[in-house]
């Protein structure tokens, strides 16, 4: 079938392949201090690491990309590590009349894959 | 709001930023010649190019990633160019008894963004 099995063990060694990592960021880092009140610091999960051949392939396209990258590395880039899902986050932000709570669905990564 | 405006003009010069590019691939290239009969060659649209700050940001997470990459380039990778949507593709493949047409929804990229 079109779907070769994406592999889950990292051939590059521990922590080198595509995975979720927590990055601490302040409102100042994000440029949000003028409109967000809370939280003052965000634990941002982000996708980092390399995508060796067929590691955590997002889909058939990613598998093809991995294969063609092996054949034509100058023309076809390797798949890269991006979020596969997100954790919703609530921000408390200023409004014209006061404060409001708003949920953001695409702010913090929950899982990663190679696309 | 959390969404800064993703920009669409490439600051790196024509063809350098994240875009869709066609790559010709044979069934042999893909390792599919034993089970796919048609097409013998696929025009594969793939996402290639760089993702400079806020260029075609997929979502808020990608905008945060771009900003934090500017602050901590060793810790946070730049966003990378991945498919935002796909064009369905029909493959004619061998079955035990003959041939069958099957649609694959995630094989050829139709659009790209920076995630």
């Amino acid at each position: 079938s079109a779907h070769a099995h994406p592999r889950d063990s990292c051939p590059l060694g521990p922590g080198r392949c595509c995975h979720l990592e927590t990055v601490q960021a302040t409102l100042e880092d994000l440029g949000w201090s003028d409109w967000v009140l809370s939280p003052r610091q965000l634990q941002l999960s982000m996708c980092v690491g390399e995508c060796p051949h067929l590691y955590r392939s997002a889909n058939t396209h990613a598998q093809i990309k991995a294969r063609l990258h092996g054949l034509q590395p100058d023309k076809v880039p390797a798949p890269c590590c991006v979020p596969s899902s997100y954790t919703p986050v609530v921000l408390m932000h200023r409004t014209d009349s006061g404060v409001s709570l708003q949920t953001y669905d695409d702010l913090v990564a929950r899982g990663c894959h190679c696309a | 709001s959390a969404h800064a405006h993703p920009r669409d003009s490439c600051p790196l010069g024509p063809g350098r930023c994240c875009h869709l590019e066609t790559v010709q691939a044979t069934l042999e290239d893909l390792g599919w010649s034993d089970w796919v009969l048609s097409p013998r060659q696929l025009q594969l649209s793939m996402c290639v190019g760089e993702c400079p700050h806020l260029y075609r940001s997929a979502n808020t997470h990608a905008q945060i990633k771009a900003r934090l990459h500017g602050l901590q380039p060793d810790k946070v990778p730049a966003p990378c160019c991945v498919p935002s949507s796909y064009t369905p593709v029909v493959l004619m493949h061998r079955t035990d008894s003959g041939v069958s047409l099957q649609t694959y929804d995630d094989l050829v990229a139709r659009g790209c963004h920076c995630a």
Epitope: - | S38, P39, P88, V89, V90, M92, L101, T103, V108
Partner: antibody, heavy 118, light 107 residues
Framework: QVTLKESGPGILQPSQTLSLTCSFS??????????VGWIRQPSGKGLEWLAH???????YFNTALKSRLTISKDTSNNQVFLKIASVDTADSATYYC??????????WGQGTSVTVSS | DIVMTQSHKFMSTSVGDRVSITCKAS??????VAWYQQKPGQSPKFLIY???YRYTGVPDRFTGSGSGTDFTFTISSVQAEDLAVYYC?????????FGGGTKLEIK
């Protein structure tokens, strides 16, 4: 479930233009590798391929009829159109449309009967 | 254009018999020949692709063979419901062309 249905004028006069519509469901003409073809069959005779149009808008025509044929598609409304200019009695036939996956015509409509008569 | 010739317009057979229908191409078409079945009052049904590949759901009593210019479609054990006209069609190059058809009659 794939279905195709042809519609046409039924009867028309010589020298007029025949306009046929193929309305389909169960597949999309924006899918790579998919096309829709037209085939006709005069009463009691064999099949004659007329034209087909692909997902990427590439078009192919029967050599003998090419100058009289126009094929087009409306992808969003799942329709394909065939026009035959300057018809005469020899164009009387049942007209079929068929879904194509590469060079397979795997699903056919029920056909629409066209009579050219003065 | 490639001309496809089915030399027999009619073939008569009995239920349970094996029957073969032939088709000849005017030039080499490799294995690019399809076969269709058209029952009375119905639209054609796709059976065989690229000379020998049965399409999904087609009973295994239907087989095809051949390459180059000579092709054969075989029903290993004819059933009453196989009464139909059978057409070959080349898909080697456009314009696609059909044979004239062979009508299978059940004795």
């Amino acid at each position: 479930q794939v279905t195709l249905k042809e519609s046409g004028p039924g009867i028309l006069q010589p020298s007029q233009t025949l306009s046929l519509t193929c309305s389909f469901s169960g597949f999309s003409l924006s899918t790579y590798g998919i096309g829709v073809g037209w085939i006709r069959q005069p009463s009691g005779k064999g099949l004659e391929w007329l034209a087909h149009i692909w997902w990427n808008n590439n078009k192919y025509f029967n050599t003998a009829l090419k100058s009289r044929l126009t094929i087009s598609k409306d992808t969003s409304n799942n329709q394909v159109f065939l026009k035959i200019a300057s018809v005469d009695t020899a164009d009387s036939a049942t007209y079929y449309c068929a879904r194509m996956g590469y060079d397979i015509m795997d699903y056919w409509g029920q056909g629409t009967s066209v009579t050219v008569s003065s | 254009d490639i001309v496809m010739t089915q030399s027999h317009k009619f073939m008569s057979t009995s239920v349970g018999d094996r029957v073969s229908i032939t088709c000849k191409a005017s030039q080499d078409v490799n294995t690019a020949v399809a076969w269709y079945q058209q029952k009375p009052g119905q639209s054609p049904k796709f059976l065989i692709y690229s000379s020998s590949y049965r399409y999904t759901g087609v009973p295994d009593r239907f087989t095809g063979s051949g390459s180059g210019t000579d092709f054969t479609f075989t029903i290993s054990s004819v059933q009453a419901e196989d009464l139909a006209v059978y057409y070959c069609q080349q898909h080697y190059s456009t314009p696609w062309t059909f044979g004239g058809g062979t009508k299978l009659e059940i004795k």
